[in-house]
C-alpha cells in the first residue's frame, strides 16, 4: 500500500479540517510550551505545503517520511534551546532517533497554568467572533497538557465541545445550559487521557506483546461471540492504532481508526450483538461508541475450559507448537466467560497458566503436574474479589471525601516520599472508586474497580518516573503490570522514612480559601492532612481525625468572621498549637 | 563550502531602520546557495550569540525570534546568492554584532548549533 507522497495520501484520506487539527495535536502534544500562534503558522505551513502533494505528489519534498517533515517543522523554532533546553538536542538527529527522542521529552506534568474558565458570555462572544480559532485553542490547550492523549478521540471530544457552545450560546440562561456540559466534558476528558496513557505506558515500557494481551481480554469480555480468528483480527489493528497514537504518528492512527471502525460495522453479525446503533453514528462518534459498547451476552452452553487447557493430552504439544497462539486462545476462552472478572485479574491467571506450563512441559508427567493448574487461580480470584468488598464497605460508611482522606492516610504512610500534589491526586483518584463502581451488582464490581485502579496507578507511575523519589514505587511500577495494584495494596507503613520537619508555614492558611470552590477547599485539606501524615507516620486514625475535625471547624468559624484574616492568623496559631500537643510534635 | 561576508550594519538612530545584507560565495562546484538553510543572528556586549530569524531553502518558511516579531523581516534571493534582514522601530537593545549563518539542514533549523558555516559578522549600534 506505498503511496508516492505519505504527506497526500493522509491529507486525502483525512480531509483539510481532521488534517489541521491532527498536525495541531501532534505539535502541541511535542512542544507543550509553544505559544498557540507559533502552532497555528506551523500547522498552516504544513497545510499548505500537503495540498501542494496533492497537486503534485512527484513535488519536491512530497516523498519525505512524516516523522522528517513534521521533526523539520518543529526544529525551525526560533526558540527551541531557550524553551526546551536539551529537547533541542533531538533535532541534531536523523529520524527515526529525532522523532524517539521527542517521545522522550513528553512531560506528563508540564508546568503550565491551570486553564482557569472565563465567564460564560466571555467565551460565547470568543466563540461566535471566531469560531474557528476558539476549537483550535480547545485542541491546543487539552493537546499540551495530555501529550498522550488519544488524537482521534480529541476530535471527538472538541466536536462535543463546539456542539455545546452552538447550542448553549443561543439559550436563555446560557450558563445553565453550557457549565455542565463543560464540566462533562472535563471529567470525561481527565477520565480519556488517563486511560490511553495506561495503554501508551503499556506498549512503550512492557511491549506490544503485553497491550495485546490485555486486548485479547477485554474485546474477549465485550464480544464473547466472535471466534478468537476474529478477535485476532482486532488485536491485531487496534494494537497497531495505539501503537501509532502512542508513537505521535496521529494521522496514519487516526485513518487507521476509522479503518478499523469500518471494518468492525461491515463484520458486526461476527462480531457482536450490541453494534447495530453504534454503527449508524457518523465516524468520530461511531469510533468512540464502538470503544464503549457494552458486553455482548455470552453464548448459550460454553463447554468447560478443563477439557482442552487441563484434560487434553495435547496440552504440552499444542503449547510447544505455538506458545502465545494457545495462550491467547486460553486468555479468549477465560475472558468470554468471565466478565464479571478485571482484565489485570484474567492476565494474571493466563500468567500463572503460561508458568505452570512451562515447568509441568518439562517435567517426567506433565499431566500429573498441570492438573490442579485451576486450583491455583482460586487464591487470585479471592484477593480482589475481597478487597473490593472491604473497601466498598469503607466508601459506603464513610462518603467519599472521607473515603479518599482514608487513602490519602493509607499512601502516603507507604510511600511518603512521594510529592504532596501527586499524593492529593493519586489518592483523590483512587478515592473516586467508591462513586464510580460500588453502585454496580457483584458481576460488575470487579472489572470496574481493578481496571480503573489501574489507570489512577499508572498516573502515579508516569509521574513518579518524571522524578523518581521512592524506590518502593519503582519496583510496583516496574516489575509488572498486571501486579501493580496487588503490589501497591501490599506495601505496609514505610518503616525507613524519616519524618519530615515540621514547617508552621505549611500549615498557614488566609482568608481566600473562603472564596475557593468546595472541591478547592477540599484539596486544601487533603494536601494539609498528606502534610500532617509527613510530619508524623505513626500518627493514629483517631489522632488524624481529631486534627482534621479541628482544621475545617477553624475553617468554618474564619470564613464567617468579620476580620477573616485576623481570624486565620490567630486562631491558626492557636490551630497548629494544639494540633502539635495532639500529635506530641 | 560556503563563504559569507555580511553588509549594511553601522550607527543607527532609535526609530529608525536596518537593512544587512549576505552575499554568499565559494560554493562547492555542484552545490547552489538554495541547498542550505539559512539563519541571522546577534550577539551584543556580554550576552550569547542569539538567533533572530531563520528561513528555509526556498524562502517560503520564516520564523522569528519574539523580541524582533512584527518588525523584521528575513528574506532571500536565490538567482543572487544573497540573504537580507530588514529591521524596523529599532531600539538601543537592538545593538549587537549581526551574523549571517548556512545549514546543510534546508529547512533552516532553530538551533544555533547546526549552522557550520559563519560571516564575520557586522556591527549594529543604535544611538541617537
Known amino acids: 500500500d506505498a503511496h508516492k507522497s505519505e504527506v497526500a495520501h493522509r491529507f486525502k484520506d483525512l480531509g483539510e479540517e481532521n488534517f489541521k487539527a491532527l498536525v495541531l495535536i501532534a505539535f502541541a502534544q511535542y512542544l507543550q510550551q509553544c505559544p498557540f500562534e507559533d502552532h497555528v503558522k506551523l500547522v498552516n505551513e504544513v497545510t499548505e505545503f500537503a495540498k501542494t502533494c496533492v497537486a503534485d505528489e512527484s513535488a519536491e519534498n512530497c516523498d519525505k517520511s512524516l516523522h522528517t517533515l513534521f521533526g523539520d517543522k518543529l526544529c525551525t523554532v526560533a526558540t527551541l534551546r531557550e524553551t526546551y533546553g536539551e529537547m533541542a538536542d533531538c533535532c541534531a538527529k536523523q529520524e527515526p532517533e529525532r522523532n524517539e527522542c521527542f517521545l522522550q521529552h513528553k512531560d506528563d506534568n508540564p508546568n503550565l497554568p491551570r486553564l482557569v474558565r472565563p465567564e460564560v458570555d466571555v467565551m460565547c462572544t470568543a466563540f461566535h467572533d471566531n469560531e474557528e480559532t476558539f476549537l483550535k485553542k480547545y485542541l491546543y490547550e487539552i493537546a499540551r497538557r495530555h501529550p498522550y492523549f488519544y488524537a482521534p478521540e480529541l476530535l471527538f471530544f472538541a466536536k462535543r465541545y463546539k456542539a455545546a457552545f452552538t447550542e448553549c450560546c443561543q439559550a436563555a440562561d446560557k450558563a445553565a445550559c453550557l457549565l455542565p456540559k463543560l464540566d462533562e466534558l472535563r471529567d470525561e476528558g481527565k477520565a480519556s487521557s488517563a486511560k490511553q496513557r495506561l495503554k501508551c505506558a503499556s506498549l512503550q515500557k512492557f511491549g506490544e506483546r503485553a497491550f495485546k494481551a490485555w486486548a485479547v481480554a477485554r474485546l474477549s469480555q465485550r464480544f464473547p461471540k466472535a471466534e478468537f480468528a476474529e478477535v485476532s483480527k482486532l488485536v491485531t489493528d487496534l494494537t497497531k492504532v495505539h501503537t501509532e497514537c502512542c508513537h505521535g504518528d496521529l494521522l496514519e492512527c487516526a485513518d487507521d481508526r476509522a479503518d478499523l471502525a469500518k471494518y468492525i460495522c461491515e463484520n458486526q453479525d461476527s462480531i457482536s450483538s450490541k453494534l447495530k446503533e453504534c454503527c449508524e453514528k457518523p465516524l468520530l462518534e461511531k469510533s468512540h461508541c464502538i470503544a464503549e459498547v457494552e458486553n455482548d451476552e455470552m453464548p448459550a452452553d460454553l463447554p468447560s475450559l478443563a477439557a482442552d487447557f487441563v484434560e487434553s493430552k495435547d496440552v504440552c504439544k499444542n503449547y510447544a507448537e505455538a506458545k502465545d497462539v494457545f495462550l491467547g486462545m486460553f486468555l479468549y476462552e477465560y475472558a468470554r466467560r468471565h466478565p464479571d472478572y478485571s482484565v489485570v485479574l484474567l492476565l494474571r491467571l493466563a500468567k500463572t497458566y503460561e508458568t505452570t506450563l512451562e515447568k509441568c512441559c518439562a517435567a517426567a508427567d506433565p499431566h500429573e503436574c498441570y492438573a490442579k493448574v485451576f486450583d491455583e487461580f482460586k487464591p487470585l480470584v479471592e484477593e480482589p474479589q475481597n478487597l473490593i468488598k472491604q473497601n466498598c464497605e469503607l466508601f459506603e460508611q464513610l462518603g467519599e471525601y472521607k473515603f479518599q482522606n482514608a487513602l490519602l492516610v493509607r499512601y502516603t504512610k507507604k510511600v511518603p516520599q512521594v510529592s504532596t500534589p501527586t499524593l492529593v491526586e493519586v489518592s483523590r483518584n483512587l478515592g473516586k472508586v467508591g462513586s464510580k463502581c460500588c453502585k454496580h451488582p457483584e458481576a460488575k464490581r470487579m472489572p470496574c474497580a481493578e481496571d480503573y485502579l489501574s489507570v489512577v496507578l499508572n498516573q502515579l507511575c508516569v509521574l513518579h518516573e518524571k522524578t523518581p523519589v521512592s524506590d518502593r514505587v519503582t519496583k510496583c511500577c516496574t516489575e509488572s503490570l498486571v501486579n501493580r495494584r496487588p503490589c501497591f495494596s501490599a506495601l505496609e507503613v514505610d518503616e525507613t522514612y524519616v519524618p519530615k520537619e515540621f514547617n508552621a508555614e505549611t500549615f498557614t492558611f488566609h482568608a481566600d480559601i473562603c472564596t475557593l470552590s468546595e472541591k478547592e477547599r477540599q484539596i486544601k485539606k487533603q494536601t494539609a492532612l498528606v502534610e500532617l501524615v509527613k510530619h508524623k507516620p505513626k500518627a493514629t486514625k483517631e489522632q488524624l481525625k481529631a486534627v482534621m475535625d479541628d482544621f475545617a471547624a477553624f475553617v468554618e468559624k474564619c470564613c464567617k468572621a468579620d476580620d477573616k484574616e485576623t481570624c486565620f492568623a490567630e486562631e491558626g496559631k492557636k490551630l497548629v498549637a494544639a494540633s502539635q500537643a495532639a500529635l506530641g510534635l | 563550502e560556503v563563504q559569507l561576508v555580511e553588509s549594511g550594519g553601522g550607527l543607527v538612530q532609535p526609530g529608525g531602520s536596518l537593512h544587512l545584507s549576505c552575499a554568499a560565495s565559494?560554493?562547492?562546484?555542484?552545490?547552489?546557495?538554495?541547498?542550505?538553510?539559512m539563519a541571522w543572528f546577534r550577539q551584543a556586549p556580554g550576552a550569547e550569540r542569539e538567533l533572530l530569524a531563520n528561513?528555509?531553502?526556498?524562502?517560503?518558511?520564516?520564523n522569528y525570534r519574539d523580541s524582533v516579531k512584527g518588525r523584521a523581516a528575513i528574506f532571500r534571493d536565490n538567482a543572487k546568492n544573497t540573504l537580507y534582514l530588514n529591521i524596523n522601530s529599532l531600539k538601543a537593545e537592538d545593538t549587537a554584532v549581526y551574523y549571517c549563518?548556512?545549514?546543510?539542514?534546508?529547512?533552516?533549523?532553530?538551533?544555533?548549533?547546526?549552522?557550520?558555516?559563519w560571516g564575520q559578522g557586522t556591527q549594529v549600534t543604535v544611538s541617537s
Open positions: 549563518a548556512a545549514s546543510s539542514r534546508k529547512y533552516g533549523p532553530g538551533i544555533k548549533s547546526q549552522y557550520e558555516w
Open positions: 565559494r560554493l562547492t562546484t555542484g552545490v547552489t546557495f538554495s541547498d542550505y538553510g
Open positions: 528561513i528555509n531553502w526556498s524562502g517560503q518558511y520564516t
